[in-house]
């Protein structure tokens, strides 16, 4: 038994659970997902039994081996996979455990503006970046672009302090997860702060 293998897949994609076996006489190979049997292979008779019908078209063993390829991945395919190789030549089955993380392809992140104030000609607010469907394991980075700056800021919230009369700045939120990356529509400081310009002490959402 080797150490647990971590695998990553994307929704709609495919992943292969690699299996290298040194066992000479294999009686059966059983693949399990979260304790539920997934596939049983009996090499002697060339039998492959897929436990659930809905998985029949998603399961494959490429190149005639015993590595399991799972296609048309869904979010709920994330979990623990376990393979046991059974043989009369072994006292105990040879086993391998895998952890699969399935991630969604990210759509454009959405940006919302927090409470805005405009004091002494300086517009102060927070921009918050988020994914509409609450995708997991998303890392956010902000790019602040302008003549005077080209900065990156980690995290979903970007604090902004922009003085009227300064050159305009553009803010872009970049969202990443292990399988994809995407970016928001650009936000211009001048447009963002225009609403608060009329009233120097105004606060707005």
């Amino acid at each position: 038994s080797g150490p647990v293998k971590e695998l990553v897949g994307s929704v709609g994609g495919a992943v292969t659970f690699p299996l290298k076996s040194k066992v000479k006489q294999v009686d059966s190979i059983v693949w399990t997902f979260n304790t539920t049997p997934l596939v049983t292979i009996q090499p002697e008779g060339g039998t492959i039994i897929v436990t659930q019908n809905r998985n029949r078209e998603r399961v494959d063993f490429p190149d005639g081996g015993y590595s399991l390829k799972l296609s048309k991945l869904k979010k709920n395919d994330s979990g623990i996979y376990y393979v046991g190789i059974y043989s009369s030549s072994l006292q105990q089955p040879s086993t391998q455990e895998y952890v699969l993380h399935v991630y969604e392809h990210l759509s454009k992140p959405k940006v919302t503006m927090g409470l805005q104030s405009n004091k002494n000609g300086t517009c102060v607010t927070n921009l918050t970046c988020c994914m509409e469907h609450g995708e997991e394991d998303v890392i956010y980075t902000w790019k602040a672009l302008g003549q005077a700056a080209n900065e990156s800021h980690n995290g979903s919230i970007l604090p902004i302090s922009w003085r009227w009369g300064e050159s305009d700045m553009t803010f872009i939120c970049v969202a990443r997860n292990p399988v994809s990356r995407n970016f928001s529509s650009p936000i211009l400081a001048r447009k963002l702060c225009e609403g608060a310009a009329d009233d120097p002490d105004s606060s707005m959402v």
Partner: antibody, heavy 119, light 107 residues
């Protein structure tokens, strides 16, 4: 020094196959998305496709999806392009490219490797 | 696919001239545009990204502007070392696409 070095180009007959390699050094290869871009003689740049750090996502230009396969081996700091069913119009210099800060624009390019498809 | 159409395809200007290259996208790409310079026999070099941000080490005579579908690369004062082909690239959506290039020569 950040460097990408392509290899594997050469003369191949129409219908043949070729595998290009790109060796990366000077940066943490396993953290970067990587792309292949090609340039036919005297022509412009054409993006072939990209692969994410752990190979779980590969995006291709639709016109090239069925003949090119992008892969990588992080342990070897290497990127690969398997090219099948080659035709004369695939004659080009093939570049591997790294996106700046893992964004979408390329700040590091290999020197390119020339693939000539001819009988 | 998003088409990126550059104009002119080639131009000849004198040292010190202001040179403008335009790139038109077939659909809105926001500001997801980069510009590259490729000198004869060399590899492409990143000049501009996010439509107007200069890459590290790029001389300030190079500037980019535009958003939506119309983008411009400007060389404020053409230098002999600027002889090259310039390409725009959109990265708003897959597949990433490049313009056909603009060849810049010295008169």
């Amino acid at each position: 020094e950040v460097q990408l070095v392509e290899s594997g180009g050469g003369l191949v007959q129409p219908g043949g196959s070729l595998r290009l390699s790109c060796a990366a050094s000077g940066f943490d290869f396993s953290r970067y998305w990587m792309s292949w871009v090609r340039q036919a003689p005297g022509k412009g740049l054409e993006w072939i496709g990209e692969i994410n750090p752990d190979s779980s996502t590969i995006n291709y230009a639709p016109s090239l999806k069925d003949k090119f396969i992008i892969s990588r081996d992080n342990a070897k700091n290497s990127l690969y392009l398997q090219m099948n069913s080659l035709r004369a119009e695939d004659t080009a210099v093939y570049y591997c490219a790294r996106p700046d800060g893992n964004y979408w624009y390329f700040d590091v390019w290999g020197q390119g490797t020339l693939v000539t498809v001819s009988s | 696919d998003i088409q990126m159409t550059q104009s002119p395809s080639s131009l000849s200007a004198s040292v010190g001239d202001r040179v403008t290259i335009t790139c038109k996208a077939s659909q809105d790409v926001g500001i997801a545009v980069a510009w590259y310079q490729q000198k004869p026999g060399k590899v492409p070099k990143l000049l501009i990204y996010w439509a107007s941000t200069r890459h590290t080490g790029v001389p300030d005579r190079f500037s980019g502007s535009g958003s939506g579908t119309d983008f411009t690369l400007t060389i404020s004062s053409l230098q002999p070392e600027d002889v090259a082909t310039y390409y725009c690239q959109q990265y708003s959506s897959y597949p990433y696409t490049f313009g056909q290039g603009t060849k810049v020569e010295i008169k």
